[in-house]
Interface confidence: medium
């Protein structure tokens, strides 16, 4: 593992069953309690849950666990201390870190990534660090939808 | 530090609307990661959600008052405003702005300072 | 909508003693509650966030646990200063609701 520190769990929020729809961006609608940022809508939450318990509540929300484009793609939530879990996990198959579309993980994205235990899952900080945990620890997470 | 101040008149005559304006100081209105809330408190009694008002516009509002509830919100003065139509002597209470974070506590974490709205004639 | 049911009405206590307020929520709102102190002519202060978080500023002798439909708000040793009404808040779901408030009172 690298010297970043998780800090104490900060919880925020959960989707309530109202889906109107906000537009938050200069192109997109998300539902409600989501942040619209450039084109892509957010989920932030609160509740801590296992990798898989994470990748599930963001199906069920019809999206998906982060898969970053970019390392300042959540700068609106740079002031953040947190760790989340995002789509990121080891294919024994591909011998490689794929994200949950089945795309590679870039060598730019995480430079550290080759020390990274192929057993954990990926948490992600919003200024750009990330930590391998056991995919059965618990953490917030983040859902993204990418609405163009 | 995040302030916000209330204004508005303190008397509405039964079945005209009720107006109330708050202005954000120390911070931008639009920020991605707050909404923006209205909460009424009658005399004696417990706290009532009116609505929220993202930056967009986009609102979401009480079910009990949507029908007579509008939220809006002006980034170029970084103030958002509450109009209650065809208020009753029900809707005397003291009204707050405030805001909710998106991203930590998700609970009313700055208040305005209130405003005693009184409906009589 | 989610209702909040808060239990005792009225807490009479002295200075120095300990306080347990109960919120009882009618369907499960995970960890998503806050409490909130008020003081008369006041608007009411943040305490508690995601049910156990403390607000910034917030003395530590006021905790916060529970989770799903019953949760408490507890101050370890009150203060003059804590004798007020303490509300709960919900945004498990929308709307956003509260509860009728505990009103806390020196004996």
């Known amino acids: 593992k690298n010297s970043f520190t998780k800090l104490s769990i900060e919880p925020a929020f959960t989707p309530g069953p109202n889906i109107e729809l906000q537009k938050d961006s200069d192109c997109c609608s998300c539902q409600e309690k989501w942040v619209g940022y450039r084109c892509n809508c957010y989920f932030i939450s609160s509740e801590q849950k296992t990798w898989n318990e994470s990748r599930h509540l963001c199906a069920s929300q019809k999206s998906s666990l982060l898969q970053l484009q970019n390392t300042d793609e959540l700068d609106f939530m740079s002031s953040s201390q947190q760790f989340y879990w995002i789509g990121l996990s080891y294919s024994e198959e591909h011998t490689a870190w794929l994200w949950e579309n089945g795309s590679a993980l870039s060598q730019y994205l995480f430079p550290s990534f080759e020390t990274f235990n192929t057993k954990n899952c990926i948490a992600y900080n919003p200024n750009g660090n990330a930590l391998d945990e056991s995919c059965e620890d618990k953490n917030r997470y983040i859902c993204k939808q990418q609405l163009i | 530090q995040v302030q916000l101040q209330q204004s508005g008149p303190g008397l509405v005559k039964p079945s005209e609307t009720l107006s109330l304006t708050c202005t954000v100081s120390?911070?931008?209105?639009?920020?991605?990661?707050?909404?923006w809330g209205w909460i009424r408190q009658p005399p004696g009694k417990g706290l009532e959600w009116i609505g929220s008002?993202?930056?967009?516009?986009?609102?979401y509002y009480n079910p009990s008052l949507k029908s007579r509830v509008t939220i809006s919100v002006d980034t170029s003065k970084n103030q958002f405003s509450l109009n209650l139509s065809s208020v009753t002597a029900a809707d005397t209470a003291v009204y707050y702005c405030a805001r909710l974070p998106l991203t930590g506590e998700f609970a009313f974490d700055i208040w305005g300072q209130g405003t005693m709205v009184t409906v009589s004639s | 909508e989610i209702v909040l049911t808060q239990s005792p009405a009225t807490l009479s206590l002295s200075p120095g003693e300990r306080a347990t307020l109960s919120c009882r929520a009618s369907q499960s709102v995970s960890t998503y509650l806050a409490w909130f102190q008020q003081k008369p002519g006041q608007a009411p202060r943040l305490l508690i966030y995601?049910?156990?978080s403390r607000a910034t500023g917030i003395p530590d002798r006021f905790s916060g646990s529970g989770s799903g439909t019953d949760f408490t708000l507890t101050i370890s040793r009150l203060e003059p200063e804590d004798f007020a009404v303490y509300y709960c808040?919900?945004?498990?779901?929308?709307?956003?609701?509260f509860g009728q408030g505990t009103r806390l009172e020196i004996k």
């Open positions: 120390g911070g931008s209105i639009s920020s991605i990661i707050y909404y």
């Open positions: 008002i993202y930056y967009s516009g986009s609102t």
């Open positions: 808040q919900q945004y498990g779901s929308s709307p956003i609701t």
């Open positions: 995601g049910a156990s």
